[in-house]
Each structure stands twice: as C-alpha cells, then as structure tokens.
C-alpha cells in the first residue's frame, strides 16, 4: 500500500495530464483527487503511465467506489483494465456494448481470460439476456469468448440469435455449454433443408442426444471425424455399426486412427466384433462371437 503523505502545494493536481508521469507513487497518491480522476478518466489512457503508477490510480478509484465503478468510469479504463481482477469486475454493472468493445480491445494479447469471462458475464446480466448485438460484438471482438459464459448465462440466448454464431466461436465450448446451445440451434435451423441444416447444426452437435444423431445417420450427411469425436459419449454408445457407417459415410475410414480415443474406444467395446469387422478397418475390442450381453443396470433399476 502507498503511504499517506500531504501533497506539496506545487504538485497539486487540477487536471489529469501528461505532467503526472513525472510524479512518484506517493505524490500521485497524495495529490490526485479520486473524484477528479473519475471525472477525467477519458484522458488517462492517452498518458504513458507506468504499471506502478496505474496501481496507484486503481487504488484511488477503489477507494472512491468500494461497491464497484460506475459505467462512465469503466468505459474509459483503457489500460487500467489490465490491473483489474475478476473480483473487481464482479462488482460492476455494464450494459453498453461500446464499453465491452473498448475493454475487449485492451485485453487482446494479454492473459486475461478470467477477467474477460467475468466482464462478459456482467454485460449479459446488465443487459438481461444474451441478445444478438451482444453475440455480434463477441464474435467480432473476441472469438471463442462465447464459451467463457456459464451454461446458466447461455440459457438466456434466444434461438433467433443462434444464426449469428460461427463455428469457431464454439471451439472452446464444453459439453455442458453445448447441451444448452444445441436445442436452441435445432429450433433456429429447423426449417432448413437436409444438407443446409447439417452445415448449420454441425458446430452444436456436441450437445445432441442419441435420437438426433441416429436421425442424422439416415440423411446421408457424411459427418467428418472431428465432429464425430466431439459428440457426447452417451450419444455415441447406443449407435449400431450400421448407423455409424451411414452417419460417417467415407469418413468412417478415419475410425481406425481414433480406435484408442473416446468416444470411439468406448463405442467399440459395446459392438459385436463381427459387426466391427464389416467396417474393413481391423478395429479390435468388440464383443466376441457367442457372448451374451447382460445389462445389469436394468435389473438394478427394477430392484
């Protein structure tokens, strides 16, 4: 913490300008009025403060706004945003997409994924839902950031907005997030024709249930291996060899390379070896001929 001293008369600050870069930390602490700083935040980013000096300015704002900064200050944080922790950001109420854009630009190239995720979360809360304008801003200024939102926040996305989401925006989404987004995408694209529907729904398929994957296998879609590998394990396990063959088309040849990786490995273990042999890839690990499969989970459920 910066020690409290009184400000020498000749160092008194009446406006935020470049002369402040020559102030020592304790002089900044003593001479800069927090209210003046807040009122002239738009000038701060144009001044080449050191990181140490920015620490002092942040300390000033923290004292003035212990409950969190107002958006008029947040919008003009500039490089001061790099000093913010997720805990600081959690106190904010942000509704303006201009504020979001400004801070996303500042964070680019810095390791700030936790701060950015918290900021986006605050924007969604502030705006009430993840609307089209917010999604457009995220896809333009922060590809992949959509996946930093919790499933709860993502549930506020209206299906009509799903069309604005690009495949690369979903690259880092986990299964729980895709579970939320997939039904919305299914609804959003339901009126499209088979091939066009598949192109659109493909990035969301990590959240698809078995019955939807089975339905796709009847539509000659030729699903690529990368998409297949992202399907939920629970969605893949009930598929038959014939269904996987129809689902993947020529891409089924790629199963050999994925033989040891989930969900392919787990799926192989549930297939009859005879059926696996029909794929012509030498896949091993299926249920040998003549073996009876008992599903004990059914018996447990009944007892």
């Amino acid at each position: 913490d910066v020690e409290r001293t009184t400000c020498p008369p000749e160092k008194e600050v009446h406006e935020i300008d470049e002369s402040l870069i020559f102030y020592k930390k304790r002089e900044l602490e003593a001479c800069v009025d927090a209210a003046l700083l807040a009122a002239q935040m738009d000038r701060v980013d144009a001044i080449p403060f050191t990181y140490e000096q920015l620490d002092v300015l942040k300390h000033k704002l923290d004292e003035l706004y212990p409950q969190g900064y107002p958006e008029s200050v947040i919008r003009h944080l500039g490089h001061l945003f790099l000093k913010m922790s997720p805990e600081d950001i959690r106190k904010w109420n942000v509704t303006s997409l201009e504020t979001l854009k400004a801070l996303l630009k500042v964070s680019k190239g810095h390791e700030m994924s936790a701060q950015v995720a918290t900021l986006i979360d605050r924007v969604v809360v502030g705006r009430g839902q993840l609307d089209k304008d917010t999604v457009d801003t995220l896809t333009a200024f922060c590809p992949g950031c959509l996946c930093s939102l919790s499933p709860e926040r993502l549930s506020s996305v209206p299906p009509s907005v799903i069309g604005a989401v690009r495949p690369q925006d979903l690259d880092t989404c986990g299964p729980r997030q895709l579970d939320v987004l997939y039904p919305k995408a299914r609804l959003a694209f339901q009126n499209m024709s088979g091939s066009e529907y598949f192109v659109k729904i493909r990035p969301f398929l990590g959240g698809a249930p078995t019955e939807d994957v089975k339905a796709l296998s009847q539509q000659n879609v030729s699903m690529d291996l990368a998409t297949f590998m992202k399907l939920r394990r629970e969605a893949v396990l009930p598929l038959t060899v014939a269904e996987v063959q129809k689902l993947l088309g020529p891409h089924v040849e790629g199963l050999k390379v994925e033989e040891q990786h989930s969900p392919v490995r787990d799926w192989i273990l549930k297939q009859r070896q005879d059926d696996l042999d029909t794929l012509g890839l030498g896949l091993q690990g299926g249920i040998p001929n003549g073996y009876l499969i008992l599903d004990l989970s059914v018996r447990e459920a009944l007892s």
Partner: antibody, heavy 121, light 107 residues
Framework: EVQLVQSGAEVKKPGASVKVSCKAS????????MHWVRQAPGQGLEWMGN????????YYNERFRSRVTMTVDKSTSTVYMELSSLRSEDTAVYYC??????????????WGQGTTVTVSS | DIQMTQSPSSLSASVGDRVTITCKAS??????IAWYQHKPGKAPKLLIH???ELQPGVPSRFSGSGSGRDYTFTISSLQPEDIATYYC?????????FGGGTKVEIK
C-alpha cells in the same frame, strides 16, 4: 511382405469397358481399404475412389461416379476397378494403393505396379 | 473437396542445388500431407508423411514443413537420382487429392 499385384495392360475401343484387378497379399486383406489412383499421360495423379474390402462398400470421386464400379472378392483377396464408357482421355496408368492409418484418414504406403489402359479406335 | 495447388509445375536445377516445392490447400489440412516421388514406369514412392515425417530409408536431404494451408517440400542438395515428378497428397479428408505435380530436371 505386403504386395499388390495388378493385372496386365489392356487396349480398349472408345465406349467399351475395362476391368483392372489388384491382388493383395502379405497382410490381413479385410483390415485396410483399397484405393484406386490413375495417371494419364502428361497429367498428375488423380484419386478415383476406394472400397471397403470387408463389405464391398465403395466411395467414388465425383468425377468418376457415373462410370466407375469397384468390387471385391474376399476369397481371393482381390479388388477390381471397372471403368465404363471409355474415351481417349481415360488412357492412363491405373494404380491400386493401400493406406497406412497412422494419422487422419491415412496416406498410401503400398502401391501396385500399375496397369496401363490404352483407349484407341 | 479439398484442392491442392502445387508449384512450380516444373523446374530445372543443378546437382547440389537446393530445390523447393510448395503445395497450398484450399482449406486447413492440419499437417495431413504426404509427399511422393514418381519415376516413369514405376509406382509412386512415399517420401514424407504428416508434413515432415521421413519414411524409413529415405535420404535426409528430403524434408518437409508447413502448417494450415501452406506446405513446402525441400531437397537440400539435388542428386542425379532425384530426377522425377514429385506430388503432394492431402489426407485430411477421406476423399484424397493430389497436387498437380512438379517435374524436377537437372540443368
């Protein structure tokens, strides 16, 4: 030792069909799909399609789909590639090739010696 | 389908020269590219797979590099026995495609 032995050279008239064979040995025949690649004089290599040797299911390059038929005889570990409605541009060396599934969909590590097909009136 | 654009289509170099051939894919192929040497009357010979992995028995003067859509094949010191046509193959997609080929000649 893996070997892919192809049938001999053929001379065909335009409009006719040709059937080229490729007999595999030295590995488990039903564990690797077989591919066909051709090279016309002065042209590059062109992938024609492939076949699953276990169930006989083929996938063709769109360019040849209407004229090519790939089949398999498991009892003799032989695959066949038949090309119909031949034209002079089909004059080429036809190769069968076996992939190695080391990564992605596999690259070709074993090739047949090639079969020259000449289409001439 | 993925298109592979190979250049140059032919080149002439002296023994000992460094020779470079490029292949550009129409989309990202994640390093799934192989390089073949093809001599008249013979089957193509696999030299390199997965962008830079040299096949056993292939001389170390052959090398490969690249990522995304752009790939390069290099012969560090051209030898008389390297006279052939060289092809790239993408296998990132089950519907494989070759580059147009590069005919390498000795000056």
């Amino acid at each position: 030792e893996v070997q892919l032995v192809q049938s001999g050279a053929e001379v065909k008239k335009p409009g006719a069909s040709v059937k080229v064979s490729c007999k595999a040995s030295g590995y488990t025949f039903t564990n690797y799909w077989m591919h066909w690649v051709r090279q016309a004089p002065g042209q590059g290599l062109e992938w024609m399609g492939n076949i699953n040797p276990s169930n006989g299911g083929p996938y063709y390059n769109e360019r040849f789909r209407s004229r090519v038929t790939m089949t398999v005889d498991k009892s003799t570990s032989t695959v066949y590639m038949e090309l119909s409605s031949l034209r002079s541009e089909d004059t080429a060396v036809y190769y069968c090739a076996r992939p190695y599934y080391g990564s992605s969909y596999g690259y070709f590590d074993y090739w047949g010696q090639g079969t020259t097909v000449t289409v001439s009136s | 389908d993925i298109q592979m654009t190979q250049s140059p289509s032919s080149l002439s170099a002296s023994v000992g020269d460094r020779v470079t051939i490029t292949c550009k894919a129409s989309q990202d192929i994640n390093k799934y590219i192989a390089w073949y040497q093809h001599k008249p009357g013979k089957a193509p010979k696999l030299l390199i797979h997965y962008t830079s992995e040299l096949q056993p028995g292939v001389p170390s003067r052959f090398s490969g590099s690249g990522s995304g859509r752009d790939y390069t094949f290099t012969i560090s010191s051209l030898q008389p026995e390297d006279i052939a046509t060289y092809y790239c193959l993408q296998y990132a997609n089950p519907l494989r495609t070759f580059g147009g080929g590069t005919k390498v000649e000795i000056k």
